[in-house]
């Protein structure tokens, strides 16, 4: 089996409004070479949430926690969550191409639901 695996271990995450949401993603290899991006939604209308190589994403930070020998952590945290952030988030590996990078493999997705802020 040649393909790396994209592992999004949590099918769903629930976060209170105003809190931060951690979206986990691990990959089994850096090969094939290419960037990793996060999107909300799938298909042509998906929204880019984070691309480390370019862009400005002030609410997103990267969170690499426990380092395991057999995989690589590409998790993110989104701060100050609002109900508008609800949706399914995908961690996507691209393969470096010319002239454009090619989508290689996507994680299964993590559904983010937003609870009302505790009063």
């Amino acid at each position: 089996e040649d393909e790396l695996q994209v592992i999004q271990p949590e099918k769903s995450v629930s976060v209170a409004a105003g809190e931060s949401a951690t979206l986990r993603c691990a990959m089994t290899s850096l090969i094939p070479v290419g960037p990793i991006m996060w999107f909300r939604g799938a298909g042509a209308g998906r929204e880019l949430i984070y691309n480390q190589k370019e862009g400005h994403f002030p609410r997103v930070t990267t969170v690499s926690e426990l380092t395991k020998r057999n995989n690589l952590d590409f998790s993110i945290s989104i701060s100050n969550i609002t109900p508008a952030d609800a949706g399914t988030y995908y961690c996507v590996k691209f393969r470096k191409g010319s002239p454009d990078d090619v989508e290689f493999k996507s994680g299964a997705g993590t559904e983010l639901s937003v609870r009302a802020k505790p009063s």
């Epitope: 040649d2 089994t28 290899s29 090969i31 020998r69």
Partner: antibody, heavy 118, light 111 residues
Framework: EVQLVESGGGLVKPGGSLRLSCAAS????????MSWVRQTPGKGLEWVAT????????YYPDSVKGRFTLSRDNAKNSLYLQMNSLRAEDTAVYYC???????????WGQGTTVTVSS | DIVLTQSPASLAVSLGERATISCRAS??????????MHWYQQKPGQPPKLLIY???NLESGVPDRFSGSGSRTDFTLTINPLQAEDVATYYC?????????FGGGTKVEIK
């Protein structure tokens, strides 16, 4: 015990060819990215080539691109580096190395010496 | 290409003392909080051996007197306390971007 055993090195004239082999044992070869790294007294360690676990993707630095070809046979737990149009600057000890995640080099063979000289 | 500059080129340290080796990258080797910088030990006549992976993680079987630290462009390998069997040349290596590159090496000797 992990073992990587290189072979195929030797003396070759400039413009000539050599085929290096690496026999792997003690780990699941087909799950690992594999690479060659060479070492010279003058230039130190230099990455030479990398191949994905299934053999679909290969990567080379500009210094060897178009001259070297990396392949693998997972059924035989073997890695091969075909080196053509050899130059004096290709003279080095060539190490076979494994990479579980395609990142750090986990295990290295003992190396095989390639000498390019007229 | 990412250039890795190791310093010093050679280092003489007394047994039981601390040896510190620096590796500076010409650009960041960090991605998503991972630092793709690794350290190897090479003894004469032997291949390199992985000591530290991804900046600070000790490879299995490596004594805990070896440690790594740093992020982005500045990394350090520390040996404390130095033992006689640690006499070797140490190399840093980045796998953040192709072509993968190595530092020029630091030779550690006993004072």
């Amino acid at each position: 015990e992990v073992q990587l055993v290189e072979s195929g090195g030797g003396l070759v004239k400039p413009g000539g060819s050599l085929r290096l082999s690496c026999a792997a044992s003690g780990f699941t070869f087909s799950s690992y990215v594999m690479s060659w790294v060479r070492q010279t007294p003058g230039k130190g360690l230099e990455w030479v080539a990398t191949i994905s676990s299934g053999g679909t993707y290969t990567y080379y630095p500009d210094s060897v691109k178009g001259r070297f070809t990396l392949s693998r046979d997972n059924a035989k737990n073997s890695l091969y580096l075909q080196m053509n149009s050899l130059r004096a600057e290709d003279t080095a000890v060539y190490y076979c190395a494994s990479q579980l995640t395609g990142s750090e080099f986990d295990y290295w063979g003992q190396g095989t010496t390639v000498t390019v000289s007229s | 290409d990412i250039v890795l500059t190791q310093s010093p080129a050679s280092l003489a340290v007394s047994l039981g003392e601390r040896a510190t080796i620096s590796c500076r990258a010409s650009e960041s080797v960090d991605s998503y909080g991972n630092s793709f910088m690794h350290w190897y030990q090479q003894k004469p006549g032997q291949p390199p051996k992985l000591l530290i992976y991804r900046a600070s993680n000790l490879e299995s079987g490596v004594p805990d007197r070896f440690s790594g630290s740093g992020s982005r462009t500045d990394f350090t390998l520390t040996i404390n306390p130095l033992q006689a069997e640690d006499v070797a040349t140490y190399y840093c290596h980045q796998s953040a971007d192709l072509p993968w590159t190595f530092g020029g090496g630091t030779k550690v000797e006993i004072k």
